[in-house]
């Protein structure tokens, strides 16, 4: 598989990987996006692991107010956080794409 | 870097991989864009290598009308084959995330 | 502390439409909440209305939905409500209120309501 | 929709009493319960969220429990300022609804 199909499969599987922990199994509650958050994107959370900015992060992303992140929610979120790299990328005028 | 984190890292640098190739280096024309899709996601595009196709394509993605697709466009085009994915991964049970 | 101020005309014609206003003050009107408009009727049942939040996202009680438009104006910090095709139905008090971020979404912050009613 | 019940719809009782609301919803809400105190002619006022959670200010006689479908909101001592309305809120899902009130008066 291409890198670009690849990291597709990653953030398919990674929603996975948390959401079936516990309640509906096709969304993540507050319990798995905390964990999915600390464990996958530490670098997106930085030092903000109290309670509020977690309930924030939650409320923020539940676009339909059910508690819950789907995998809609959670693709737009990803999205959001693609657009800040991007940001930062745009912002280095050499950048190169970084290698893996 | 997590998974996740590189995921996001493949999804920015491929966009810039094709976008900077010519006019606006941060729009895909169509040109670039029909590289992407046939070099960096061959299995979405399958036997559909026909003008026609790609022109739907792009047209199906360019929601500003400005017949480029910025990176917004482009992660909300990566959103929606990731929910197809994830409708596949949902359609069987016991199936796991695919292991790399 | 944070304070709702509604505002709007307390009579409206049957038909016409019911326009509305909720300025918020001591906090700034950020995306980590959701902003809503709920109303009572003389009965003192009360029924949610809709509410608008992060990245503009709206949801509306279907029950209202065609009749109903709301938006804001971050840099006013105010929120609006629009109620097409009124009847004596809607006669009602409404409520502008803030929506907290933690479990359930609690209605924390409240405005003192105003009296809506519709009559010709 | 989800219905949500309240009983009673009205009590009668004394200062230093234990009063017991209760709210019934259609289905379950997973926690996801807030209970309002409403005096005559003002707005609602924030009591306890998700079930037992109480708000900032909020003195600790009132309390809640519940779980599923059932919950139930407790003031431990009737005080003279807790005659009013209560009213429970489901934040499970939209639309938010609200129970029909219970109001508390004095014996």
């Known amino acids: 598989a291409r890198p670009l199909e690849e990291a597709l499969d990653v953030i398919v599987s990674t929603f996975h990987k948390y959401s079936g922990k516990e309640g509906d199994k096709f969304k993540l509650n507050k319990t798995e996006l905390k964990e999915l958050l600390t464990r996958e994107l530490p670098s997106f959370l930085g030092k903000r692991t109290d309670e509020a900015a977690f309930q924030k992060v939650m409320s923020n992303l539940d676009s339909n107010r059910d508690n819950e992140v789907d995998f809609q929610e959670y693709c737009v979120f990803l999205s959001c956080i693609a657009m800040m790299c991007n940001e930062f990328f745009e912002g280095c005028p050499d950048k190169e794409p970084r290698k893996k | 870097a997590r998974p996740l984190e590189e995921a996001l890292d493949v999804i920015v640098s491929t966009f810039h991989k094709y976008s900077g190739k010519e006019g606006d280096k941060f729009k895909l024309n169509k040109t670039e864009l029909k590289e992407l899709l046939t070099r960096e996601l061959p299995s979405f595009l399958g036997k559909r290598t026909d003008e026609a196709a790609f022109q739907k394509v792009m047209s199906n993605l360019d929601s500003n009308r400005d017949n480029e697709v910025d990176f917004q466009e482009y992660c909300v085009f990566l959103s929606c084959i990731a929910m197809m994915c994830n409708e596949f991964f949902e359609g069987c049970p016991d199936k796991e995330p695919r292991k790399k | 502390q944070v304070q709702l101020q509604e505002s709007g005309p307390g009579l409206v014609k049957p038909s016409q439409t019911l326009s509305l206003t909720c300025t918020v003050s001591g906090d700034s009107f950020t995306n980590d909440y959701y902003w809503n408009w709920i109303r009572q009727f003389p009965g003192k049942g009360l029924e949610w209305i809709g509410h608008?939040?992060?990245?503009?996202?709206?949801n509306y009680n279907p029950s209202l939905k065609n009749r109903l438009s709301m938006s804001r104006d971050t840099s006013k910090n105010q929120f609006s409500l629009k109620l097409s095709s009124v009847t004596a139905a809607d006669t009602a008090v409404y409520y502008c209120?803030?929506?907290?971020?933690?479990?359930?979404?609690?209605?924390?912050?409240w405005g003192q309501g105003t009296l809506v009613t519709v009559s010709s | 929709d989800i219905q949500m019940t309240q009983s009673p719809s009205s009590l009668s009782a004394s200062v230093g009493d234990r009063v017991t609301i209760t709210c019934r919803a259609s289905q379950d809400i997973r926690n996801y319960l807030n209970w309002y105190q409403q005096k005559p002619g003002k707005a609602l006022k924030l009591l306890l969220y998700y079930t037992s959670r109480l708000h900032s200010g909020v003195p600790s006689r009132f309390s809640g429990s519940g779980s599923g479908t059932d919950y139930t909101l407790t003031i431990s001592s009737l005080q003279p300022e807790d005659f009013a309305t209560y009213y429970c809120?489901?934040?499970?899902?939209?639309?938010?609804?609200f129970g029909g009130g219970t109001k508390v008066e004095i014996k």
């Open positions: 608008i939040g992060y990245g503009g996202n709206i």
């Open positions: 209120t803030r929506e907290s971020f933690y479990d359930g979404y609690p209605f924390d912050y």
């Open positions: 809120q489901q934040g499970n899902s939209l639309p938010r609804t």
